[in-house]
Structure formats: structure tokens, C-alpha cells
């Protein structure tokens, strides 16, 4: 039938950061190609990445339609050059992915400190509100737009001259912290979704220190 050497995909894995979402699987194809289908629990199957020799498929366009839905994908295997051929049961071989709920599971990308400004003994640290691929009314939403108050940021800061660290939290994208006059400080931030049980925290942002061009100092 031409399907003898066709193998089902396995190790189907969702890789998702800030809603950019790719399904990956194995094995690398030998004399076969793949097609991916995705649906919500209650929806119809939609085909993507037709007859591909890749072992990944970007499903971002589908999941951003409703990031709070739960999605299921499946990967079909076909003999190369004979994609009409089916398995012994009259169906092409396929394997299901784990379920995936983007809002609960997408990884939080590494945040970036946009700026910091010192006014006297206060420093305002601003975290960049990263744009996602989630759309509303033809506009791309930011991470804050999507998560609202479910998203907090943790700031770590310390004097350049010392190892003692302090921390602060915000449910906006700004911190206003007290500092000692005449001291330089370094900053790093982390995104957190406290209500989650998995993928709760991002990696730390790159460290930014006062005295570098990103910040601004004003003596009032």
C-alpha cells in the first residue's frame, strides 16, 4: 500500500513564549511527510503546515484567536510522494499532542528594563511592555493588555558597591523605589504570573546599572 515504512510522529511538544507558539515533534522524516491539524475542544479541525518535511509547525495564528481556549493538535504522517495513501485502517497514521491552554501555559519571555530615572532619592524603573501576536480590533496587544493584573513584575536591585539585594513588586510596569543619595544601583526584573501552577516566572532581564546610558539622573 506504500505505507509500510510510515511511522507515527511522537514526542509532540508545545514550545510557546509570549504566545508565539510552535508545535514540535519527532522523528526527522525519512520517506514521509507531515500535516498538522489543530482545534479547540469544541471546534473543528484546521489543517496547517501541509505535507511538510519539517518537524515543527507554527500555530501562533490559530491560538491567538482565543488564548484562553484549550487546544489540541495532531500530526499526520504520509508516505512521501504518495500523500493520498492511507494506513491499514483507511486513515493516515497520526498522533495527538498534549492539550495546551496558552493563557495558562505560554512561557513568559525575558523582560527588558526600558528605562530608569532618578529624581533625588527616588528611582523610577520602567519595564518594557512587550508586544505579543495576540490581536484585538486589528491591534497587537501587549503582555499587560493580555494578562492585566494577573501579571506582576519583581525587581531586584542592589548598590553597585555591595552584594546586599532588595526586592520590590509591581502590578503595573513601573517601580518607584527609595535609594541612597550618591550611590549607583543595578537592576534586574522578572515577570511573574502568581495564579499559575506552571511556567510562573520568566528568566531575569539583563542587568542594568546606573551610570550607563539607559538611565537618566536628575538632582532635585
Amino acid at each position: 500500500s506504500g505505507t509500510t515504512n510510515t511511522v507515527a510522529a511522537y514526542n509532540l511538544t508545545w514550545k510557546s513564549t509570549n504566545f508565539k507558539t510552535i508545535l514540535e515533534w519527532e522523528p526527522k522524516p525519512v520517506n514521509q511527510v507531515y500535516t498538522v491539524q489543530i482545534s479547540t475542544k469544541s471546534g473543528d479541525w484546521k489543517s496547517k503546515c501541509f505535507y511538510t518535511t519539517d518537524t515543527e509547525c507554527d500555530l501562533t495564528d490559530e491560538i491567538v484567536k482565543d488564548v484562553k481556549q484549550t487546544y489540541l493538535a495532531r500530526v499526520f504522517s504520509y508516505p512521501a510522494g504518495n500523500v493520498e495513501s492511507t494506513g491499514s485502517a483507511g486513515e493516515p497514521l497520526y498522533e495527538n499532542s498534549p492539550e495546551f491552554t496558552p493563557y495558562l501555559e505560554t512561557n513568559l519571555g525575558q523582560p527588558t528594563i526600558q528605562s530608569f530615572e532618578q529624581v533625588g532619592t527616588k528611582v523610577n524603573v520602567t519595564v518594557e511592555d512587550e508586544r505579543t501576536l495576540v490581536r484585538r480590533n486589528n491591534t497587537f496587544l501587549s503582555l499587560r493588555d493580555v494578562f492585566g493584573k494577573d501579571l506582576i513584575y519583581t525587581l531586584y536591585y542592589w548598590k553597585s558597591s555591595s552584594s546586599g539585594k532588595k526586592t520590590a513588586k509591581t502590578n503595573t510596569n513601573e517601580f518607584l523605589i527609595d535609594v541612597d543619595k550618591g550611590e549607583n544601583y543595578c537592576f534586574s526584573v522578572q515577570a511573574v504570573i502568581p495564579s499559575r501552577t506552571v511556567n510562573r516566572k520568566s528568566t531575569d532581564s539583563p542587568v542594568e546599572c546606573m551610570g550607563q546610558e539607559k538611565g537618566e539622573f536628575r538632582e532635585i
Partner: antibody, heavy 117, light 107 residues
Framework: QVQLLESGAVLARPGTSVKISCKAS????????MHWVRQAPGQGLEWIGG????????MYDPKFQGRVTITADTSTNTAYMELSSLRSEDTAIYYC??????????WGQGTLVTVSS | DIQMTQSPSSLSASVGDRVTITCKAS??????LSWYQQKPGKAPKLLIY???SLADGVPSRFSGSGSGTDYTLTISSLQPEDFATYYC?????????FGGGTKVEIK
Amino acid sequence: QVQLLESGAVLARPGTSVKISCKASGFNIKDYYMHWVRQAPGQGLEWIGGNDPANGHSMYDPKFQGRVTITADTSTNTAYMELSSLRSEDTAIYYCARDSGYAMDYWGQGTLVTVSS
Amino acid sequence: DIQMTQSPSSLSASVGDRVTITCKASQDIKSFLSWYQQKPGKAPKLLIYYATSLADGVPSRFSGSGSGTDYTLTISSLQPEDFATYYCLQHGESPYTFGGGTKVEIK
């Protein structure tokens, strides 16, 4: 289910150190923050410090800075608190607690540290 | 450092009474405030997180309100098992600070 199991009671001499462990189960400490709080007999709760096991950042109340070290071993899912130069005023129950970002939502059973000569 | 002023330090009440405990922060803590109940010989137990959210398994007679610097814990109808000491905690900025506690006793 989530549990924090602390090491047993300690009797220590003034000037020595004590290291208390807090073994977590039911969650990965790397996904949370771990804190230490103490309560002297008949007194209120006092924050000692905390640690982010994912990146090693530790924060301390200035009152304890230089005397306390908070660490975590992610391979064993265990948080630690070491307090040095002990004095009689350090006699207290020491609690570890998990910080979700919204609250310290789970607490250990407490470890009684008695400092006496 | 942020100071937390909790009041009253103690109160006497009867079963069925409505009880209110307040915590005032020395600066805006952006709702990073939680409330705990502690009984003698036991670890503190979380009641309210993020100022207003009820923790899992906590009876609905407990509620939290407030924002900015002023926060309140209310017990709508005091039950026998509610006689205990209550603490607020600000965790918006280190060093984290607890209120001094409120001991709720039987009248």
C-alpha cells in the same frame, strides 16, 4: 499536596551558628520564592529574609544582614537558613514559607531554636 | 522601610459579632498585602491574599478590602474557631513587614 517539612528543634550555644532546612514537596521551589520568618516566645511575626531559588537572589532584613544566609538546593527541592553569632534573643520558632507572588501561602511547621549557655 | 500599623492590638467579641481589623502602610503597597490567622502552637494560616482574594478553603465570612495604604480584614459573623491572633503582611517591597498582630478574644 504542597508541604514544607522543616528540620528538628535545635539547642545552640551563644556565639555559634544554626542551619535549618525546609524540604518542599508537591511543587518545585524554582517556580516560587522561599522565605524565612521567626517568632520569639509571646511575640509577633518577624521577616528574616527570602530567596529566589531560580536565580539565587537573596534578600534580608537589614537587622539580620551579615548574620544570616538563605540558600536553596534545587536538586533536592530544599531551602536553607543559616544564622550565625547566635544570642539569647534569637531564641524563637523559625518558619519557612512559600511566596507565590501574591502571599506566603504555605508554611512549614516551624523549628524551635533555643539559644542558651 | 515600610511600616505596618495594625489595629486594634486586641479585641473582645462574642460569637456572631462582626469584627474589623485594619492595617495601615507607611506608603502605597499596591495591594501586595495578605492576612494570616495564627492559633497557639501552630504556624500562621493564609486567609486573604492580594488584599481582597480569599485563600482556598477559607470560609466566606472572612473578607479583605482596601488599596494604596489602607487595608481591612472583616469577619462578618465571628465563630468559636475564629478566636486567634491575626496578622497582616506587606510583601510589596523588602524588607517585608508584618503588622503587630490583633488578638481576638472571647467576650
